[in-house]
C-alpha cells in the first residue's frame, strides 16, 4: 500500500529505436507526478524526469553510456505538492520496469537508400550510414560503428516489370549485383541482426527504382 | 522448441489446386524466411519459392511461376503454399524450411517433416 | 542460376572410411554454402553453413571446406547412421541451388 490518493505506475515500457530510448508507463497521474531513476545491474541509482506529470522519460543519455550493459529503471509515484510524502513502509511508492538491454533490444530504425549506380550488368546499392546517440570520443556513432559485422542488410530488388523479389545480402552497407541490361529495378532494404532473437529486423526501406535521381547510369 | 508442420497434401487431379500449410512454432515467423522445398519421388530437392513475412515478399522458381502462391499469416504463424494448375510433374513432397543467417551467409536450420503431393488422374 | 555439381552421384564405403563429397559452383559465391544430409523418408538436416562451420548437434567426424568455387564435406570415419543421401546448397544469389546429391552406401 501506498501514500493515500497515489497509484503506483503499470505497465512499464520500454520504446526504443536506434538507441533512441524512452521508457513509458500508466497511468495518466491525477494528483500525483513521477520520478524516474535507472540503473546498471550493478550500478548505482540516478534520478531523471523529477516530478513530472508525464508518462514517458527519455532515458537516452544514460543508456547510450554502455548499450551492451543490462539496464533498470523504476518510476516513483508521489502525491502533488507533497513530493516529501511516503508510502507506509516509509518510501515512496515505486514500480520497477523489465531489464533492458539496447545492443540486443533497441529496434533497428528503417534504413534508407542513399544511392545506387549502374555500371553496365552491375548495380553498387548503398545503404544510409544512420547516425546514432552513442558517443565515443564525443563523436556520435553510426549502427555499423556500434553493431559492426553484427548487422547486416538483406537488399530485395526486382524488375520493374515482375513481381518477384530477389534478395542479397552484405555486412557492409553496399551491394553490388547483377541486373539485366535495359531492365529496370526497385530496390527495398532491411537492416538485421542475425545474432538477436527479439527485434531482429527493421521495416524495410522506402521503395528506389532505377529511373529516379537517386541514381547514376554508366555504360 | 522449434517445429514446422506441414499439411495439406493429398491426391489431386491435373489442372487442379491444392494449399499447403506450414505451422511454426517455437519462433515467430516474421523474424524468418520461410522456404518452400520439393522432392519429386527418387530425385533430389529443388528448390520452390520463398517468402519473407515481414513485408510478405515472395520469389518462386521458374518451374512454378505463375502458378503457385506463398503467402504467410504472422498471427496464426503459418506460411502457404498455393498450388493452381497441377500437373503431374508437380508430384512431390513439399517441405517448408527456416531460413536463418550467420552473418550473411543463410542456411535452412528447420525443416518440416513434408507432405505429399500426388497429381494424377 | 548457379549451378551448383555435385560428385560423386554415389559411393560405397564402409564404416571407419574416410569420405569426400564435392560440390563445385559455376560461379563465385563466396562461403554461402551449406551442407544437408537425408534419410529416406525424413526431412533434410543441416550439417554445415557458411562452408565450414559445424551446425549445432552435428558430431564433430563431419567437416566442410572451401577452395574458391569448389566445397568439399568430409566425413572423417564413417559411421553406420551416415549411410544417407547428401546435398550442398548455395544462398549467395536468388534462386538458391542444390547439389543433385551423393548417395552413401554400405559397400
Known amino acids: 500500500s501506498g501514500t493515500t490518493n497515489t497509484v503506483a505506475a503499470y505497465n512499464l515500457t520500454w520504446k526504443s529505436t536506434n538507441f533512441k530510448t524512452i521508457l513509458e508507463w500508466e497511468p495518466k497521474p491525477v494528483n500525483q507526478v513521477y520520478t524516474v531513476q535507472i540503473s546498471t545491474k550493478s550500478g548505482d541509482w540516478k534520478s531523471k524526469c523529477f516530478y513530472t506529470t508525464d508518462t514517458e522519460c527519455d532515458l537516452t543519455d544514460e543508456i547510450v553510456k554502455d548499450v551492451k550493459q543490462t539496464y533498470l529503471a523504476r518510476v516513483f509515484s508521489y502525491p502533488a505538492g507533497n513530493v516529501e510524502s511516503t508510502g507506509s513502509a516509509g518510501e515512496p511508492l515505486y514500480e520497477n520496469s523489465p531489464e533492458f538491454t539496447p545492443y540486443l533490444e533497441t529496434n533497428l530504425g528503417q534504413p534508407t537508400i542513399q544511392s545506387f549506380e549502374q555500371v553496365g550488368t552491375k548495380v553498387n546499392v548503398t545503404v544510409e550510414d544512420e547516425r546514432t546517440l552513442v558517443r565515443r570520443n564525443n563523436t556520435f556513432l553510426s549502427l555499423r560503428d556500434v553493431f559492426g559485422k553484427d548487422l547486416i542488410y538483406t537488399l530485395y530488388y526486382w524488375k520493374s516489370s515482375s513481381s518477384g523479389k530477389k534478395t542479397a545480402k552484405t555486412n557492409t552497407n553496399e551491394f553490388l549485383i547483377d541486373v539485366d541490361k535495359g531492365e529496370n529495378y526497385c530496390f527495398s532494404v532491411q537492416a538485421v541482426i542475425p545474432s538477436r532473437t527479439v527485434n531482429r529486423k527493421s521495416t524495410d526501406s522506402p521503395v528506389e527504382c532505377m529511373g529516379q535521381e537517386k541514381g547514376e547510369f554508366r555504360e | 522448441e522449434v517445429q514446422l508442420v506441414e499439411s495439406g497434401g493429398g491426391l489431386v487431379q491435373p489442372g487442379g489446386s491444392l494449399r499447403l500449410s506450414c505451422a511454426a512454432s517455437?519462433?515467430?515467423?516474421?523474424?524468418?524466411?520461410i522456404h518452400w522445398v520439393r522432392q519429386a519421388p527418387g530425385k533430389g530437392l529443388e528448390w520452390v519459392g520463398y517468402?519473407?513475412?515481414?513485408?510478405?515478399?515472395?520469389y518462386y522458381a521458374d518451374s512454378v511461376k505463375g502458378r503457385f502462391t506463398i503467402s504467410a499469416d504472422t498471427s496464426k504463424n503459418t506460411a502457404y503454399l498455393q498450388m493452381n494448375s497441377l500437373r503431374a510433374e508437380d508430384t512431390a513432397v513439399y517441405y517448408c524450411?527456416?531460413?536463418?543467417?550467420?552473418?550473411?551467409?543463410?542456411?535452412?536450420?528447420?525443416w518440416g517433416q513434408g507432405t505429399l503431393v500426388t497429381v494424377s488422374s | 542460376d548457379i549451378q551448383m555439381t555435385q560428385s560423386p552421384s554415389s559411393l560405397s564405403a564402409s564404416v571407419g572410411d574416410r569420405v569426400t563429397i564435392t560440390c563445385r559452383a559455376s560461379q563465385d559465391v563466396n562461403t554461402a554454402v551449406a551442407w544437408y544430409q537425408q534419410k529416406p523418408g525424413k526431412a533434410p538436416k543441416l550439417l554445415i553453413y557458411s562452408a565450414s562451420f559445424l551446425y549445432s548437434g552435428v558430431p564433430s567426424r563431419f567437416s566442410g571446406s572451401r577452395s574458391g568455387t569448389d566445397f568439399t564435406l568430409t566425413i572423417s570415419s564413417l559411421q553406420p547412421e551416415d549411410f544417407a543421401t547428401y546435398y550442398c546448397?548455395?544462398?549467395?544469389?536468388?534462386?538458391?541451388?542444390f547439389g543433385q546429391g551423393t548417395k552413401v552406401e554400405i559397400k
Open positions: 517468402i519473407d513475412p515481414s513485408n510478405g515478399y515472395t
Open positions: 517455437g519462433f515467430t515467423i516474421g523474424s524468418y524466411w
Open positions: 524450411a527456416r531460413a536463418d543467417y550467420y552473418y550473411v551467409d543463410e542456411y535452412w536450420d528447420y
Open positions: 546448397q548455395q544462398h549467395y544469389t536468388t534462386p538458391p541451388t
